[in-house]
C-alpha cells in the first residue's frame, strides 16, 4: 500500500487585504490515523494556524466536513486577511501517538501574498 502523500496543489496564492484566502490540501490515504494541522512558516518558529484536534481558530473555516467518513480534503479558508498573514503555509499530517501525536508528513507549502486593498 502506498504511503500517504500530502498534496498542496498551489505553490502560491495572492489575495487582497480584507478578503479570504483558500489554502488547498488533500491526503492520498486515510492511514495513518491522526490529526491535520496547518502552520505558517517552518521550523521552531512556525505559527499554528489550525489544529483539527483541539483549539479555537476563529478566522479559519474548513472547506469540507473534516469529521465526515473517508474525507481526504483538508483545505482551509482564512478570513479577513492582513499583511501580517503573508507567508508560506504548510498542511501537516500527524500520526496518533501517546502521549503526543508525532509529525508524519508535510505538504510542500503554499505561499500567501497579500495585495493592498483596492481603493
Amino acid at each position: 500500500e502506498d504511503e500517504l502523500q500530502v498534496i498542496q496543489p498551489e505553490k502560491s496564492v495572492s489575495v487582497a487585504a480584507g478578503e479570504s484566502a483558500t489554502l488547498r490540501c488533500a491526503m492520498t490515504s486515510l492511514i495513518p490515523v491522526g490529526p491535520i494541522m496547518w502552520f505558517r512558516g517552518a521550523g521552531a518558529g512556525r505559527e499554528l494556524i489550525y489544529n483539527q484536534k483541539e483549539g479555537h481558530f476563529p478566522r479559519v473555516t474548513t472547506v469540507s466536513e473534516l469529521t465526515k467518513r473517508n474525507n481526504l480534503d483538508f483545505s482551509i479558508s482564512i478570513s479577513n486577511i492582513t499583511p501580517a498573514d503573508a507567508g508560506t503555509y504548510y498542511c501537516v499530517k500527524f500520526r496518533k501517538g501517546s502521549p503526543d501525536d508525532v509529525e508524519f508528513k508535510s505538504g510542500a507549502g503554499t505561499e500567501l501574498s497579500v495585495r493592498a486593498k483596492p481603493s
Epitope: G18, L48, R59, T82
Partner: antibody
Framework: DVQLVESGGGVVRPGESLRLSCAAS????????MNWVRQAPGEGLEWVSR????????DYAESVKGRFTISRDNSENTLYLQMNSLRAEDTAVYYC????????????WGLGALVTVSS | ETVLTQSPATLSVSPGERATLSCRAS??????LAWHQQKPGQAPRLLIY???NRATGIPDRFSGSGSGTDFTLTISSLQTEDSAVYYC??????????FGGGTKVEIK
C-alpha cells in the same frame, strides 16, 4: 472561564534579574500565542514580548531586546518572562495577555505583577 | 511603525449622556482595531475587536465604528461604572503591537 495569574514580581536593584510566571487555565493554552504587556506607573500600555503557540517563535519590543526572554511550558500551561539587567525604567505592572488567534488582538488579560527596580 | 493617536486625552461626561472617543492610525489598519477598558487599579479588559464587534459579556451601550485610519468608540448612555481609561490597539501590522495613549473618561 479563562484565567491568567501572574507571579514573581518584586523589588530588585538595577542590574539584577527577575522571572515572571503566568499560569493559564480555561482554554487550550498550546494553541494560542501569548504576550507580555507592561504599564509604568501613571502611564499607558506598552507591548513587551510575544511567543507563538509552539514556543519557537518570539518577538520583543526594542526597549527590552537582548535583556528579556519570553518562554512557555505547554505541558504546564505556563508562560514566563526572564528579565535580566533590569533598569529603573522597567518598573511597571507586567500583564500576560492571551492572543485571540495567531494574528489578533488580546482577548484576556491577567491581573498583573508589579516589578519595581530601585537602588 | 503604525502610531495610534487617541483623543481627547480626558473626557468628562454626565451619567446618561453619550461619550465619543477617537482613535486615529498613522496608516491604514483595515478593520484590525480593538478597544480595551482599564478601570483604576484593575487589568485591561477587551471591549471591541475588529473595529465593530463587541466582546463576550460587554453591554450594548458600547459600540465601535470606523475602518482604515479613523475609529470611534461610543458609549451611548454613560454609567458611573464606565469611569476608566480606554485604549485602542492595532493588530494589522506587527510586531510591535501598538496601543494608543489612552482616553480617560470621567463622570461629571
Amino acid at each position: 472561564d479563562v484565567q491568567l495569574v501572574e507571579s514573581g514580581g518584586g523589588v530588585v536593584r538595577p542590574g539584577e534579574s527577575l522571572r515572571l510566571s503566568c499560569a493559564a487555565s480555561g482554554f487550550s493554552f498550546s494553541s494560542h500565542a501569548m504576550n507580555w504587556v507592561r504599564q509604568a506607573p501613571g502611564e499607558g500600555l506598552e507591548w513587551v514580548s510575544r511567543i507563538n503557540s509552539g514556543g519557537g517563535g518570539t518577538d520583543y519590543a526594542e526597549s527590552v531586546k537582548g535583556r528579556f526572554t519570553i518562554s512557555r511550558d505547554n505541558s504546564e500551561n505556563t508562560l514566563y518572562l526572564q528579565m535580566n539587567s533590569l533598569r529603573a525604567e522597567d518598573t511597571a505592572v507586567y500583564y500576560c495577555a492571551k492572543q485571540y488567534d495567531w494574528n489578533g488582538f488580546f482577548d484576556y488579560w491577567g491581573l498583573g505583577a508589579l516589578v519595581t527596580v530601585s537602588s | 511603525e503604525t502610531v495610534l493617536t487617541q483623543s481627547p486625552a480626558t473626557l468628562s461626561v454626565s451619567p446618561g449622556e453619550r461619550a465619543t472617543l477617537s482613535c486615529r492610525a498613522s496608516q491604514t489598519v483595515g478593520s484590525k482595531l480593538a478597544w480595551h477598558q482599564q478601570k483604576p487599579g484593575q487589568a485591561p479588559r477587551l471591549l471591541i475587536y475588529d473595529a465593530t464587534n463587541r466582546a463576550t459579556g460587554i453591554p450594548d451601550r458600547f459600540s465601535g465604528s470606523g475602518s482604515g485610519t479613523d475609529f470611534t468608540l461610543t458609549i451611548s448612555s454613560l454609567q458611573t461604572e464606565d469611569s476608566a481609561v480606554y485604549y485602542c490597539q492595532q493588530y494589522y501590522y506587527w510586531p510591535p503591537y501598538r496601543f494608543g495613549g489612552g482616553t480617560k473618561v470621567e463622570i461629571k
